[in-house]
């Protein structure tokens, strides 16, 4: 009779975690008499999995009725398989004795455990980054087996190629982890963008797992600033607007500075969201020009998302010399000389005298005709201003001409000394009525821009005012 053989027909078996594994084993003979034992591994530290004769093995059951006398099938089922159960299992026949001795072993069955990867977790950089910068995203998934796994990166549905992936451990293990780092270049349009990590594994049956990260948590779009000045209908008032455009996130602090000092003037503001997810902020400041003796440097200072403040300055001039309105510089050298000032003053004065004469002439003609049209001329001397005599270098001579023409920005000039002349030509919308008023105003008023002090010596100052009303057909 041929000697007993132990047959383990399956060289390998793969089972999903949580399922049961069936390990097949048959013997070719009933002789010699003796029990079957199952071991995981071989060598000195092999682990007993099942002993037909004795012991308690709650997760192991025999597939056939092993207690039957003629039974030659010693296959076992191991329930609730975990990755820790992976290894090579041996079915070993023992010869009955005192003690029982090993007689024959099967060739072994390698059990591998298929375990699903955990949901990928995508994490971005700790600090926000600005457009054009490259940021790194990491994706991690754990606990899968076998080792073979596929990981892909996407940005808004477009596959990324700049990434590096590692599966750990490098060698054999009961379960594995994957770690991937992708590099993403940020653009200004990425506020609504998403980065997706996709993991495919044999256990997922073609339905990959995805982890996402919103670039809104990573990107910082710095604002662009623009400060503009618009005239308002109210006399001697200017509306200065600071437009903070295309920024993200919304966390923003805006401060107005007047000549470097924080403005206490109340400002109105509005926030709007753009289609790309960025925000716009508009803040405006109503400035009373007559309340200032000198040029006013208005600065719109913005602190965005805890970053160093950025600012845009605007020089509010009381001058006839034209100068660009917006400026990023901290201080500006005017560079004009006194000769230019006198020329400008002369031209303005000549213009004003000519206008006055024309107005008076028109009034006289109207009076002679006396055809229902009325005209009036008023000359008055205003009350005396209390003022320090020594402070005459701070004088501001102010002339305002309001004519019904197209919009024109007020030309401004910065002066090298504290004596400033200001010429402004402003227009307001034409009244609905056919009768339009043409209004000429000559006003010479001494203003003081220095901090208010008690004035021991009042100094006379005068104002001339002419008003002409003309019906216009």
């Amino acid at each position: 009779e041929e000697e007993l053989q132990v047959i383990q027909p399956d060289k390998s078996v793969s089972v999903a975690a949580g399922e049961s594994a069936i390990l097949h084993c048959t013997v070719t003979s009933l002789i010699p008499v003796g029990p079957i034992q199952w071991f995981r591994g071989a060598g000195p530290a092999r682990e007993l999995i099942y002993n037909q004769k004795e012991g308690h093995f709650p997760r192991v059951t025999t597939v056939s009725e092993s207690t039957k006398r003629e039974n030659m099938d010693f296959s076992i089922s191991i329930s609730n398989i975990t990755p820790a159960d992976a290894g090579t299992y041996y079915c070993v026949k023992f010869r009955k004795g005192s003690p029982d001795t090993e007689f024959k072993s099967g060739a072994g069955t390698e059990l591998s455990v298929r375990a699903k990867p955990s949901a990928p977790v995508v994490s971005g950089p700790a600090a926000r980054a600005t457009p054009q910068h490259t940021v790194s995203f990491t994706c991690e998934s754990h606990g899968f087996s076998p080792r073979d796994i596929t990981l892909k990166w996407f940005k808004n549905g477009n596959e990324l190629s700049d990434f590096q992936t590692n599966v750990d451990p490098v060698g054999e293990s009961v379960s594995y982890s994957i770690h991937s780092t992708a590099k993403v270049v940020l653009t200004r349009e990425d506020v609504h963008s998403q980065v997706i990590c996709e993991v495919a594994h044999v256990t997922l049956q073609g339905d990959p797992l995805r982890g996402t990260a919103n670039l809104s948590e990573t990107i910082r779009v710095p604002p662009t600033l623009e400060v503009t000045q618009q005239p308002v209908r109210a006399e001697n008032q200017v509306n200065v607007t600071c437009q903070v455009r295309k920024f993200y996130p919304q966390r923003l602090q805006l401060t107005w500075l007047e000549n470097g000092n924080v403005s206490r003037t109340e400002t109105a503001s509005t926030v709007t969201e753009n289609k790309d997810g960025t925000y716009n902020w508009m803040s405006w400041l109503l400035v009373n020009v007559s309340a200032h003796r000198d040029d006013v440097k208005l600065t719109c200072q913005v602190e965005h998302d805890g970053q160093p403040a950025v600012s845009k300055s605007h020089d509010l001039k009381v001058s006839a010399h034209p100068k660009e309105q917006g400026s990023n510089t901290a201080a500006e050298n005017t560079g004009s000389n006194e000769r230019n000032i006198y020329i400008v003053v002369g031209v303005v004065c000549t213009l004003l005298v000519a206008l006055l004469m024309a107005a008076l002439y028109l009034v006289r003609i109207r009076q002679k005709k006396a055809q229902g049209s009325t005209s009036s001329t008023r000359l008055h001397e205003p009350e005396k201003n209390a003022r320090e005599i020594t402070q005459d270098t701070n004088d501001i001579t102010y002339a305002d001409l309001n004519l019904p023409k197209g919009k024109k920005p007020a030309p401004q000039a910065a002066e090298p000394n504290n004596h400033t002349e200001y010429a402004s030509i402003q227009t307001s919308p034409q009244p609905a009525s056919e009768d339009t008023l043409t209004y000429a105003d000559l006003d010479m008023v001494h203003l003081n821009r220095t901090p208010k002090q008690p004035a021991p010596k009042p100094e006379p100052s005068f104002s001339e005012y002419a008003s002409v009303q003309v019906p216009r057909k």
């Epitope: 060598g43 041996y90 090993e102 024959k104």
Partner: antibody
Framework: QIQLVQSGPELKKPGETVKISCRAS????????MSWVKQAPGKGLRWMGW????????TCADDFKGRFAFSLETSATTAYLQIHNLTNEDTATYFC????????????????WGQGTLVTVSA | IVMTQSQKFMSTTIRDRVSITCKAS??????VAWYQQKSGQSPKLLIY???NRYTGVPDRFTGSGSGTDFTLTISNMQSEDLADYFC?????????FGSGTKLAIK
């Protein structure tokens, strides 16, 4: 295919140190334990000990404790045997040999062997 | 555990049947492997678990025994089988090899 490639022969003086490498390929390095076996000229095989490539823990046979050390460079899938303070009795061919069992917690038999590294210790 | 291969040399002829024996100093069950080593080469696994032929090993090689006495049999000796043969136990630490048996042609 599975291969274990060892470093070349070494000629050393007594008292010196030698480090032999065994580079594995064709399988997952950290799945299988690696043993070292010594064979003196014209003599039999002696198991020196093994290293668990997954944990990095090594076990030396009693006869080889002290001057012998096993190490790994997992990223290079390489195992090392280092012998300190060489003597003439260390002249031998040293083999690395791979265990058959994945996730094995002890070596058994050896289906894969390196080609051997001859270390000659001579004054 | 000492593994004793009492025959250091064995003379044989081609197509002969050769049996190489190995004795363990204590019970090792069936935790025995057999290797073949040709001159200048590394050992090659033939048998594990006392009687299981390793993948790719010709079926003229068979292993038997359990406990303390083990035998490797070459049923149809071939010239390429001329080599040293070693037994090894892996029942307990340290793993130990027999001293070897050299097969030579008569």
């Amino acid at each position: 295919q599975i291969q274990l490639v060892q470093s070349g022969p070494e000629l050393k003086k007594p008292g010196e140190t030698v480090k032999i490498s065994c580079r594995a390929s064709g399988y997952t390095f950290t799945t299988y334990g690696m043993s070292w076996v010594k064979q003196a000229p014209g003599k039999g095989l002696r198991w020196m000990g093994w290293i668990n490539t997954y944990s990095g823990v090594s076990t030396c046979a009693d006869d080889f404790k002290g001057r012998f050390a096993f190490s790994l460079e997992t990223s290079a899938t390489t195992a090392y045997l280092q012998i300190h303070n060489l003597t003439n009795e260390d002249t031998a061919t040293y083999f690395c040999a791979r265990d058959p069992h994945s996730y094995g917690n002890s070596p058994a038999w050896f289906p894969y062997w390196g080609q051997g590294t001859l270390v000659t210790v001579s004054a | 555990i000492v593994m004793t291969q009492s025959q250091k040399f064995m003379s044989t002829t081609i197509r002969d049947r050769v049996s190489i024996t190995c004795k363990a100093s204590q019970n090792v069950g069936i935790s025995v492997a057999w290797y073949q080593q040709k001159s200048g080469q590394s050992p090659k696994l033939l048998i594990y678990s006392a009687s299981n032929r390793y993948t790719g090993v010709p079926d003229r090689f068979t292993g038997s025994g359990s406990g303390t006495d083990f035998t490797l049999t070459i049923s149809n000796m071939q010239s390429e089988d001329l080599a040293d043969y070693f037994c090894q136990q892996y029942s307990s630490y340290p793993l130990t090899f027999g001293s070897g048996t050299k097969l030579a042609i008569k």
